[in-house]
């Protein structure tokens, strides 16, 4: 595939990445799949500046990111190391709360109304953000 040099239509460029901000809601797995079909991934927050950029665009709305602990430890969808990476949890979070009555705990992370993170039930239909790196090779065939 060819290397992407600019962002697709309706995506926003920031620091060599492209971002797409949904205006509807999906469960985390469906949001994850949506981004993958766009040759992207749910947003992975690696710095204070990226956090600020994303929260500016989403506003005070619960929004999925590419962080989950469905298989035990917290993991970023692109393989970025969680333990050594940027974190911005709300106080007392993540708490894997079981009291919601929906079965199980809370395995998926989202931005809250103040930008900080919370873990929640992955089935909740929140907005989401896709991210793709400009420097990575696109899966699309090159134009002839």
């Amino acid at each position: 595939g060819s290397e992407r040099t600019c962002c697709p239509v309706n995506w926003v460029e920031h620091e060599r990445s492209c971002y797409w901000f949904s205006r509807s809601g999906k469960a985390w797995a469906d949001a994850d799949n949506y981004c993958r079909l766009e040759d992207a991934h749910l947003v992975v927050v690696t710095s204070w500046e990226e956090q600020k950029f994303v929260q500016h665009h989403i506003g005070p709305v619960n929004t999925w990111m590419g962080l989950h602990d469905q298989n035990g430890p917290w993991k970023w969808v692109d393989g970025t190391d969680y333990e050594t990476g940027f974190k911005n949890w709300r106080p007392e979070q993540p708490d894997d709360w079981y009291g919601h009555g929906l079965g199980g705990g809370e395995d998926c992370a989202h931005f809250t109304d103040d930008g900080r993170w919370n873990d929640d039930v992955c089935q909740r239909p929140y907005r989401w953000v896709c991210e793709t790196e400009l420097d990575k090779a696109s899966q699309e065939p090159p134009l002839l």
Epitope: W48, K52, G115
Partner: antibody
């Protein structure tokens, strides 16, 4: 009401150390990021450092990196600034301030404590 | 580091005047621009955060605008208690740098 009270300032010789404290009350200290900001006599404001609500992350200005350490004790509702290898240019009023989530602005400030570095 | 500049560095105005102070960042800070008021011998007070949101208790004669690198603080009708020094601060990227300040005094 929100109250922040700094202490620990004074006159100190260059190269020596000092620890500032900021006692917080009137809000749930353990849920707020906190800042130190300083102001040299007759000069403008200079941001010094920020620490996450749980102490898990911290950032500081290049001018103090490796010399100053921001820390906190949530059980005592107290923020600290450990200042080592002090220089004359560190002479300033030091303010602690509460962080406003989302904007990272400082929404409440203490009255400040004066640090004078002089031989 | 992001550098912040303010203009003018000082201004004299009458009570009732409309006053505008500008602040420029050396790179894009999106909307993460805050304004503080400081009176002599006192701690600063937050006036406006994220460009245009008024902090609680701040009179509505204060307003902020801008985006990217250029921002402004406007006082629609200057009151005696508004004579002070005003600082802008970016909170997009650490270190959270301040502008050099604008002193507003009575003409």
């Amino acid at each position: 009401q929100v109250q922040l009270v700094e202490s620990g300032g004074g006159v100190v010789q260059p190269g020596r150390s000092l620890r500032l404290s900021c006692a917080a009350s009137g809000f749930t200290f353990s849920t707020y990021n906190m800042h130190w900001v300083r102001q040299a006599p007759g000069k403008g404001l200079e941001w010094v450092a920020v620490i996450w609500y749980d102490g898990s992350d911290r950032y500081s200005a290049d001018s103090v990196k490796g010399r100053f350490t921001i820390s906190r004790d949530n059980s005592k509702n107290t923020l600290y600034l450990q200042m080592n290898s002090l220089r004359a240019e560190d002479t300033a009023v030091y303010y602690c301030a509460r962080d406003r989530a989302y904007s990272s602005s400082s929404d409440f400030w203490g009255q400040g404590t004066l640090v004078t570095v002089s031989s | 580091d992001i550098q912040m500049t303010q203009s003018p560095s000082s201004l004299s105005a009458f009570v009732g005047d409309r006053v505008t102070i500008t602040c420029r960042a050396s790179q894009n800070i999106i909307s993460y621009l805050n304004w503080y008021q400081q009176k002599p011998g006192k701690a600063p007070n937050l006036m406006i955060y994220v460009t245009s949101s008024l902090h609680s208790g701040v009179p509505s004669r204060f307003s902020g605008s801008g985006s990217g690198t250029d921002f402004s603080l406007t006082i629609s009708s200057l009151q005696p208690e508004d004579f002070a020094t005003y600082y802008c601060q970016q909170s997009y990227s650490t270190p959270f740098t301040f502008g050099p300040g604008t002193k507003v005094d009575i003409k």
